[in-house]
């Protein structure tokens, strides 16, 4: 029987920078039952506060709901695991809450080809940023990711769209079902999900560009 | 206990590359941005760019875009820096260092440095 | 870019006196600056980050202080293993830049 291993906080992530919640992993557990404790301060600050939802995260976490979180201010953070022969501690963590948005995947995804009389025919991909980011502030710059493979094909063509919302593919196989899918991150953050596939068949007369 | 470990000095010649590696150890790898800082003899500091190890997205200063590759290989912790088209101003000391925490770039660890001499 | 800006190149304090370094950004930057020490031989340490938040472990007489363009470190009472040069950094819009250096030296 020993004190508790060092734990770790591995991961924080935020859908909006409204709330926030980190993940820890335990050390060993030293072969006796262990309690893990969250405490936080914000730079500036010398008052520890506690972890105020160990719930909605699922185990090992900790939510910040909206009243519990700050943008622009420093979170400095550790766990405390403790069972009968001691305690040990995890290195600090410095979290700020605009870097680790992950937000939704992009919503609205429409797809469609385009054949117009005087230029090449392409596939015209549109959507929509996902509902919970305000890019009205100004606070966030979104960035897209598109990709698309014939229905049987294992490999995904990428395509990176920056800002925009809107995207013109040209070379493409004629006869040939496509998925198509997008993805978003804020200029500092992390990767949505991938959007669900929407499915385009190509019409066999497309025109591969040259 | 956090490390980077940086590969072994190197001599190259001018219009070849080099590529340095820097080896993570006593933390999650994919948690933190990695960047790659370096020093020319007896001078400053200059940032080169950066990486998320988590999905291997990187940011380049406009000086080196076109020279400049930085990798990360999430099964054995390890960054990657190689630069290319090397003239002999590149003789520099190439530092790893990791971000400080979730958030702005400032670096709280670094690796002990790699030096690149880039002679005829 | 954002050029970061140090003065004076050089120091020169004797023990236990205070030491006031400076670096100006030629552009604004909020408190978005670092600071750092590095000796010879060896790796930057960090020190500040915020202007003015003191990293875990670093002593109470390195302090920071400053926002916007100015910005000023400051050794309250010099210890012998505090000679070294001193970097500031930005870290407001990329690409991220640092500062020539100060250097401290023992007069």
């Known amino acids: 029987q020993l004190p508790p291993g060092k734990p770790e906080i591995f991961k924080c992530r935020s859908p909006n920078k409204e709330t926030f919640t980190c993940w820890w992993r335990p050390g060993t557990d030293g072969g006796l039952p262990t309690n893990y404790s969250l405490t936080y301060h914000r730079e500036g600050e010398t008052l520890m506060h506690e972890c105020p939802d160990y719930i909605t995260g699922g185990p090992n976490s900790c939510h910040f709901g909206k009243q519990y979180t700050s943008m622009w201010r420093t979170y400095i953070m550790m766990v405390n695991a403790t069972n009968q022969m001691g305690s040990s501690f995890s290195d600090e963590l410095y979290v700020d809450v605009t870097y680790i948005v992950q937000p939704d995947p992009p919503l609205e995804l429409a797809v469609e080809v385009k054949q117009p009389e005087d230029r090449k025919p392409y596939l015209w991909i549109k959507w929509s940023p996902p509902t919970l980011i305000d890019l009205k502030t100004g606070w966030f710059t979104l960035l897209y990711e598109i990709r698309l493979k014939p229905e049987k094909a294992a490999e995904w063509e990428i395509h990176f769209a920056g800002q925009q919302t809107e995207f013109k593919i040209l070379s493409l196989h004629p006869g040939q079902k496509y998925l198509v899918q997008v993805r978003c991150k804020p200029d500092h953050g992390y990767w949505s999900a991938w959007s669900p596939a929407t499915f385009i068949q190509i019409p066999s007369d497309f025109t591969m560009n040259d | 206990e956090v490390q980077l470990v940086q590969s072994g000095a190197e001599v190259k010649k001018p219009g070849s590359s080099v590529k340095v590696s820097c080896k993570a150890s006593g933390y999650t790898f994919t948690t933190y941005w990695m960047h790659w800082v370096r020093q020319a003899p007896g001078q400053g500091l200059e940032w080169m760019g950066e990486i998320d190890p988590s999905d291997s997205y990187s940011n380049y200063n406009q000086k080196f875009k076109d020279r400049v590759t930085i990798t990360a290989d999430k099964s054995t912790s390890t960054a990657y820096m190689e630069l290319s088209s090397l003239r002999s101003e590149d003789t520099a000391v190439y530092y790893c260092?990791?971000?400080?925490?979730?958030?702005?770039?400032?670096?709280?660890?670094w690796g002990q440095g790699t030096l690149v001499t880039v002679s005829s | 870019e954002i050029v970061m800006t140090q003065s004076p190149a050089t120091l020169s304090v004797s023990p236990g006196e205070r030491a006031t370094l400076s670096c100006k950004a030629s552009?604004?930057?909020?408190?978005?600056v670092a600071w750092y020490q590095q000796k010879p031989g060896q790796a930057p340490r960090l020190l500040i980050y915020s202007a003015s938040n003191r990293y875990t472990g670093i002593p109470a007489r390195f302090s920071g202080s400053g926002s916007g363009t100015e910005f000023t470190l400051t050794i309250s009472s010099l210890q012998s293993e505090d000679f070294a040069v001193y970097y500031c950094?930005?870290?407001?819009?990329?690409?991220?830049?640092f500062g020539g250096g100060t250097k401290v030296e023992i007069k």
């Open positions: 950094q930005q870290y407001s819009s990329y690409p991220w830049t």
């Open positions: 552009q604004y930057v909020g408190t978005a």
């Open positions: 260092a990791r971000n400080g925490g979730l958030g702005p770039a400032w670096f709280s660890y």
